[in-house]
Amino acid sequence: IPTEIPASALVKETLALLSTHRTLLIANETLRIPVPVHKNHQLCTEEIFQGIGTLESQTVQGGTVERLFKNLSLIKKYIGGQKKKCGEERRRVNQFLDYLQEFLGVMNTEWIIESH
Amino acid sequence: IPTEIPASALVKETLALLSTHRTLLIANETLRIPVPVHKNHQLCTEEIFQGIGTLESQTVQGGTVERLFKNLSLIKKYIGGQKKKCGEERRRVNQFLDYLQEFLGVMNTEWIIESH
């Protein structure tokens, strides 16, 4: 993410552009894109960005819609950077267990887990 | 995940076992495992389960610690199932845009984005 625009501001601007250009983006009535069927979004980043790629290739570029896809490309880069940070630091088992506990805690409280 | 234990109950039980067996799990003082340095846990599921594998191979099995690793294996399976559901359904662009908007909205409100 370039230092001149923080990730949080980038996300906000992208949300606004997405809303503005919705009718332009849905112009292709026949296009079908894979949509995840659960709300644990972070698990699906690859599929989301593949979908964005499909959409971009089908959308007439120009003006601020170009800005939208540029932003989405920067967000993809940011997430790629975050994914890199998943395995960069080798630490004691204590600290790994802390992370695992946090992960399970988040699963326990924030994940949408369908009942079986 | 077997139908006899819902995922949410499994996660709760695993958290309790993790706490109980902490000293057993950190018995190898020299072992180092990659620990993600941000809190967007779902981005790091692969690395987390690789770490669990490393830990399991270094831990003396038996008793309820075996139950802990069995549970973690079931959670991994559950997450694998969720990842599969990321690309199963092909939908209209409107629905993809709805999902993208939710994803960015979650990024905007819930992700831990470091300031640059």
Epitope: N94, Q95, L97, D98, Q101 | S19, T20, R22, T23, L24, I26, A27, N28, E29, V37
Partner: antibody, heavy 119, light 106 residues
Amino acid sequence: QVKLLQSGAALVKPGDSVKMSCKASDYTFTEYLIHWVKQSQGRSLEWIGYINPYSGGTVYNEKFKSKATLTVDKFSSTAYMEFRRLTFEDSAIYYCARDGGYSDPLDYWGQGVMVTVSS
Amino acid sequence: DTVLTQSPALAVSPGERVSISCRASEGLTSYMHWYQQKPGQQPKLLIYKASNLASGVPARFSGSGSGTDFTLTIDPVEADDAATYFCQQNWNDPWTFGGGTKLELK
């Protein structure tokens, strides 16, 4: 209520050794690490190291590696620290403290052992 | 070793808000804990992992920060809060403590 009861004050000569104890009660001793911390007169705190009562494994601050030896007796739920080749700089209060588990904060502390090195 | 720098002393009146800072010489993610020590007593855990309130500690105490800059806040300060406050990190070996901040009440 978790308690860590430490042994009494010690007056020792330079070059001698001292072994202090820390008796834990009201929790499962083998489920939490025990740390040792030094506090010199009017000074800050220094982490000496910890022992895992489950395995007997230890992690030391490099600075204290040749000075301190940490051990445990699981049956009496007691942790020990032996400090050897004492010098005047070793005069301090020594605390044992329980590790709280998640993120390893020191959640319960003993009352401290005052060690005075004097010839 | 990771050096933790705290200002040596602060003086506040009861009822005021006070912030005690701790700056680390290198990044610690959120592995910072805070302790209170009164004269003649052992330290007492207040905050663990930067922002989590330890069991039995009044909600007047709070912690914030990540990376290299951390803060312990007491709001409002009470007469009983006169003590020395230590920060401690355990992200890097060896674990280290700050020099302590002595909080005096006016």
